[in-house]
Amino acid sequence: LPAQVAFTPYAPEPGSTCRLREYYDQTAQMCCSKCSPGQHAKVFCTKTSDTVCDSCEDSTYTQLWNWVPECLSCGSRCSSDQVETQACTREQNRICTCRPGWYCALSKQEGCRLCAPLRKCRPGFGVARPGTETSDVVCKPCAPGTFSNTTSSTDICRPHQICNVVAIPGNASMDAVCTSTSPTRSMAPGAVHLPQPVSTRSQHTQPTPEPSTAPSTSFLLPMGPSPPAEGSTGD
């Protein structure tokens, strides 16, 4: 019979491959059927009998056509900082990805092995580069004329409001405060109404960095001791 109509198992012509969804069994020296995804080889083929396939047991899988004797174990359940984006089935492994506000610090072939909380930029610092699924937020000091008054992993430095008359100059962590456009009659001429309390901080003084706390996760990232990232908190 020509190879196209032979039934498995069969001996391939010299120099010929096996066909679609078949493999060459070295022991039997025959082309034999592979097992479909979700199955594994329960009994290997012989010269006279084809592969016997069986379904994967619970919590195990095979994703590819195969002739493996045992299915692969699904990964462990997703941790509290993760969400399960793909369940463990007979044909696919469980996939865990980081929940919102976290990023993948250590990825694996599919999904994430280790999530870490996104850095929060504290007042006086804004987001220079947003966090992604696989990278942390990068903070930068707010440039003159801009400010951020929040502790946030998403807020950027915003421009100070422009005043006709400035009551309090803005700084890196506070917006400028403008005078009232129509002063009240009881006020002395030229008097400026200041909100209480009055900040005495000069306009562009940066807040002094606070000590960083370790990320609130149950693992240590593979890095030596280092100063806290500028303008970030460990919250």
């Epitope: 190879a3 196209q4 391939p12 120099g15 010929s16 491959t17 066909r19 679609l20 969804r21 592979k34 590819l64 056509w65």
Partner: antibody, heavy 119, light 107 residues
Amino acid sequence: QVQLVQSGAEVKKPGASVKVSCKASGYTFITYDINWVRQAPGQGLEWIGWIYPRDGNTQYAQKFQGRVTMTTDTSTSTAYMELRSLRSDDTAVYYCARGDRDYGYFDVWGQGTTVTVSS
Amino acid sequence: DIQMTPSTSSLSASVGDRVTITCRASQDISNYLNWYQQKPGKAVKLLIYFKSKLHSGVPSRFSGSGSGTDFTLTISSLQPEDFATYYCQQGNTLPLTFGGGTKLELK
């Protein structure tokens, strides 16, 4: 990125042979079949066969058996397809394509080599 | 050999349209149906394999359905770059065979 780059156009006389090359890059050459597919002017696509570079074993469509030879040079990640006893109806664009033998698809294609057979 | 036949050799549509291209196999091919896109002077591109699995990098507006002998490629909202020729191909048995192609043209 994964790429297949084919040799240039060829003009051949009836009865002659042609050898087209296909250089692979961006992946492990020996782990995927290289298929050859042709397309005659204004026609559809026609599968010629595949070669498995790891061992050089082949699978040819019966229509081309005895007239086609597929080979590979693993040192240069290059596949070759030689077609002999050319006829005018062999005039076509010949493509190499990386294949998947489980689902029978071609996921990366070369740019094509035009072979013209004319007396 | 398994014959693959598109329902039409050409199709006219406008940008934004929902387009379906169908393909019939001469015998049951299970789900082993693949779809390709070909543009003049460009390399052929795999769109969908195993009836409905989207190849990596292919926009989600492309989808595939069907089973046995009748299969459909759907483009949910036609984009200017989608005007091309589309081929179906069976991966069930050797020899691997293609349909004649459906040319998608601007209306």
